[in-house]
C-alpha cells in the first residue's frame, strides 16, 4: 500500500473559534445561494477505496483545487468571510505542501478528478456549491490530517 509522509496538521489549526466560525459562516452564506441540492461534492463517494492513512493526502488535493479553481476566482464574493477564510485555508495548504504519497495514487486522483469534473460541469453554480461545502472540507481535513 502507498505510504504517505508529512501528511499531518496540528490540531491547533482546528481549535481557533473565530476562524472556524468564519469558515462555517462562509459555507452557510454560499449554501443559501446554491440551488442544486441533488449533488454532493464531499461525501462517501470521495473516500471510496481510499484507506484512512491516505485520506489527508486526498483532502490536500481537494483543498488545493478548491483554493486555486474556486476560492481565488470567486474571491470578491461573500463579504466579509471570504477575505478571512481564504488566507487561513491557504496556510493549511502551505503546511501540507510536503504531504506526498510514495507509490501509486491513481485511485485517489480518480476520486478527486470526479469532484473536479462535477464542479466544472456545473460552472459557476459548481463553484458556489464547493464554497457551500467548506464546512465539510474543514471537518474532513480535521478528521483526516490531525
Amino acid at each position: 500500500a502507498p505510504i504517505s509522509s508529512h501528511c499531518r496538521l496540528d490540531k491547533s489549526n482546528f481549535q481557533q473559534p473565530y476562524i472556524t466560525n468564519r469558515t462555517f459562516m462562509l459555507a452557510k452564506e454560499a449554501s443559501l445561494a446554491d440551488n442544486n441540492t441533488d449533488v454532493r461534492l464531499i461525501g462517501e463517494k470521495l473516500f471510496h477505496g481510499v484507506s484512512m492513512s491516505e485520506r489527508c493526502y486526498l483532502m490536500k488535493q481537494v483543498l488545493n483545487f478548491t483554493l486555486e479553481e474556486v476560492l481565488f476566482p470567486q474571491s470578491d464574493r461573500f463579504q466579509p468571510y471570504m477575505q478571512e477564510v481564504v488566507p487561513f485555508l491557504a496556510r493549511l495548504s502551505n503546511r501540507l505542501s510536503t504531504c506526498h504519497i510514495e507509490g501509486d495514487d491513481l485511485h485517489i486522483q480518480r476520486n478527486v478528478q470526479k469532484l473536479k469534473d462535477t464542479v466544472k460541469k456545473l460552472g459557476e453554480s459548481g463553484e458556489i456549491k464547493a464554497i457551500g461545502e467548506l464546512d465539510l472540507l474543514f471537518m474532513s481535513l480535521r478528521n483526516a490530517c490531525i
Epitope: 486555486e68 481565488f72 470567486q74 464574493r77 463579504q79 488566507p87
Partner: antibody, heavy 118, light 111 residues
C-alpha cells in the same frame, strides 16, 4: 512592481464596438490569487465598475452593462481586454484597468480616454 | 448590493487633520472597504483597505499621514498634517455580491 497599462482606440463611432486592452508588466496575469477588473469614469464624474476576470476564465459583470460587455484574458500576452458593444455618447469615459486583491482594488492603470462620437 | 455614502466635499487648512467618512448601507456594516485617491487630471491610486475592526492595510508608498479606522457601519480615512498634494477626490469602494460599488467621492480642498 506590478504596472498596468491601458491601450484604446481614442475615438469610436456610435453603435460600434469599443475595445480596450490592459497590458501587465512586473507580474503575471496568471497569479491565482488576483482578479483583473475594468472600471470607467465619464469626464468630471464618479467611478463605475464594469466587470472582472480571473485568469482561469471566471468572469462577472456589473448587471447594468452585462448585456454589452465582454472581458477576456490572454495569458500568453499577459493581457486582458474589454469589449463594449452598441456604444453611445454615454459610454464616453476614461477606462481604467485594475487588479483586485481579495476584493479590494490595489493597483490601477493610468487610464485611457475613449470618446464616442460620429 | 451595498451602497456607500460619502459627503461631497471637505476642507481643512494646510498642516491640519481631516477625517473622511464612508458609510455602508444597512445589512452591510461588517464589510471591508478600500480607499482610493484621485488627484486632478490623474487616475485613481489605492490608499488602503479598512475592515470592520478598523485595521487597515496600506498600499505601496502611502505616507504614514494616511490612516484608516472604523466604527459600526462607518469607515474613516484620516489625513494628518495635510499637504497641498492631498487636494484630491477620495473614493471608497466595496464588493461582495458579485459586483463592486464606489461611493460618489469626497472632494478635499486644502485651505
Amino acid at each position: 512592481q506590478v504596472q498596468l497599462h491601458e491601450s484604446g482606440p481614442g475615438l469610436v463611432k456610435p453603435s460600434e464596438t469599443l475595445s480596450v486592452t490592459c497590458s501587465l508588466s512586473g507580474g503575471s496575469i496568471s497569479s491565482s490569487s488576483h482578479l483583473w477588473a475594468w472600471i470607467r469614469q465619464p469626464p468630471e464624474k464618479g467611478l463605475e465598475y464594469i466587470g472582472r476576470i480571473h485568469y482561469r476564465g471566471s468572469v462577472s459583470y456589473n448587471p447594468s452593462l452585462k448585456s454589452r460587455a465582454a472581458i477576456s484574458v490572454d495569458t500568453a500576452k499577459n493581457q486582458f481586454s474589454l469589449t463594449l458593444s452598441a456604444v453611445t455618447a454615454a459610454d464616453t469615459s476614461f477606462y481604467y484597468c485594475a487588479r483586485l486583491d481579495m476584493g479590494a482594488i490595489d493597483k490601477w492603470g493610468q487610464g485611457t480616454l475613449v470618446i464616442v462620437s460620429s | 448590493q451595498p451602497v456607500l455614502t460619502q459627503s461631497p466635499s471637505a476642507s481643512a487648512s494646510l498642516g491640519a487633520s481631516i477625517k473622511l467618512t464612508c458609510t455602508l448601507s444597512s445589512g452591510h456594516s461588517n464589510y471591508d472597504i478600500a480607499w482610493h485617491q484621485q488627484q486632478s487630471g490623474k487616475g485613481p491610486r489605492f490608499l488602503m483597505r479598512v475592515n470592520n475592526g478598523g485595521s487597515h492595510n496600506k498600499g505601496d508608498g502611502i505616507p504614514d499621514r494616511f490612516s484608516g479606522s472604523s466604527s459600526g457601519a462607518e469607515r474613516y480615512l484620516t489625513i494628518s498634517s495635510l499637504q497641498s498634494e492631498d487636494e484630491a477626490d477620495y473614493y471608497c469602494q466595496t464588493w461582495g455580491t458579485g459586483t463592486h460599488v464606489f461611493g460618489t467621492g469626497t472632494k478635499v480642498t486644502v485651505l
